[in-house]
């Protein structure tokens, strides 16, 4: 199976677009969008903190941490109306992230 | 990183049996965790997976027959309703993408009158 | 459902020869295919994940290939110690799946 110029190969993913808005002090705001190729039951999301293809039920029940979206060693928790989660870092330092 | 099997004892059928997974190293909620059985000669069969939520996915021969829970520190593996077909060593793995990079040593389940 | 059917079940090789062993998908399983080595009394080993991929700390005569639905493990100048059971398993999707295995002898 040859893949043509362009092409992902199933189940992977690919960064199209990085924007960071680093303007409000003490916070970088980034939008990322990605091109994926997710194989049937899968869906475009995020893990360890790179896009990848997940169990598309994920997204529809909005149980973003059961894509591990956080690097190993940071805890994964629910934004309180299910918008998105945050990763917290050992250290106590915390990123959130919201899904549009 | 490490993970470790224990309850593995000799049954009589029909009496419920809970095996438990404990990691060493690492946080199960960083990682989809699995049960695996292997039949003495035989070779591997998986039981099913636990997400962080709680959310669990079986083999279709498996549904009904084993319930897979965890707690913040343990993941475990009941078998319902053993018969001597459930005879074997159960491994615990666990998984990102799919594909198994860490087991446990495995624990000897034995179903006999 | 997926089902892996794993050739030969078994094979004889000599030290420093060329084992190959198969294993066939029933369906494209889109290289989502891993290799495991296990020892008598021991758990599996991860050797090989997305087909070719091999694993930190294993040997590289281990090596893997294939597409759609066949996939080949090969262990090129075999040693004593690669005298096991090597199971190929797809996760393409659930539930996942072995194959039977290959029991690999060494003379």
């Known amino acids: 199976q040859f893949l043509k110029e362009g092409q992902l190969a199933a189940g992977t993913c690919e960064i199209v677009t990085l924007d960071r808005d680093s303007s409000q002090p003490r916070r970088t705001i980034a939008r990322q969008t990605a091109r994926c190729a997710c194989r049937k039951g899968q869906i475009a999301g995020t893990t360890r903190n790179k896009p990848s293809c997940v169990d598309a039920r994920i997204i529809k029940t909005k149980q973003w941490c059961d894509m591990l979206p956080c690097l190993e060693g940071e805890g994964c928790d629910l934004l309180i109306n299910r918008s998105g989660w945050t990763c917290t870092q050992p250290g106590g330092r915390i990123k959130t992230t919201t899904v549009s | 990183q490490s993970l470790e099997e224990s309850g593995g004892r000799l049954v009589t059928p029909g009496t419920p049996l809970t095996l438990t997974c404990t990691a060493s190293g690492f946080s199960l909620s960083s990682y989809y965790m699995n049960w695996v059985r292997q039949a003495p000669g035989k070779g591997l069969e998986w039981i099913g997976i636990?997400?962080?939520?709680?959310t669990t996915y079986y083999a279709g021969w498996a549904k009904g027959r084993f319930t897979i829970s965890k707690t913040s520190t343990t993941v475990d593996l009941k078998i319902t309703s053993p018969t001597s077909e459930d005879t074997a060593t159960y491994f615990c793995?666990?998984?990102?993408?799919?594909?198994?990079?860490?087991w446990g040593p495995g624990t000897l389940v034995t179903v006999s009158l | 459902e997926l089902d892996l059917t794993q050739t030969p079940p078994s094979l004889s090789a000599s030290v420093g020869g060329t084992v190959t062993i198969n294993c066939l998908a029933s369906e494209d399983i889109y290289s989502a295919l891993a290799w495991y080595q296990q020892k008598p009394g021991k758990p599996p080993t991860l050797l090989i994940s997305g087909t070719s991929n091999l694993e930190s700390g294993v040997p590289p005569r281990f090596s893997g290939s294939g597409s759609g639905t066949d996939y080949t493990l090969t262990i090129g100048g075999v040693q004593a110690e690669d005298a096991a059971t090597y199971f190929c398993q797809g996760y393409s999707s659930y539930p996942l799946t072995f194959g039977a295995g290959t029991n690999v002898e060494i003379k």
């Open positions: 793995a666990r998984t990102v993408s799919g594909y198994f990079d860490i």
């Open positions: 636990i997400y962080p939520s709680g």
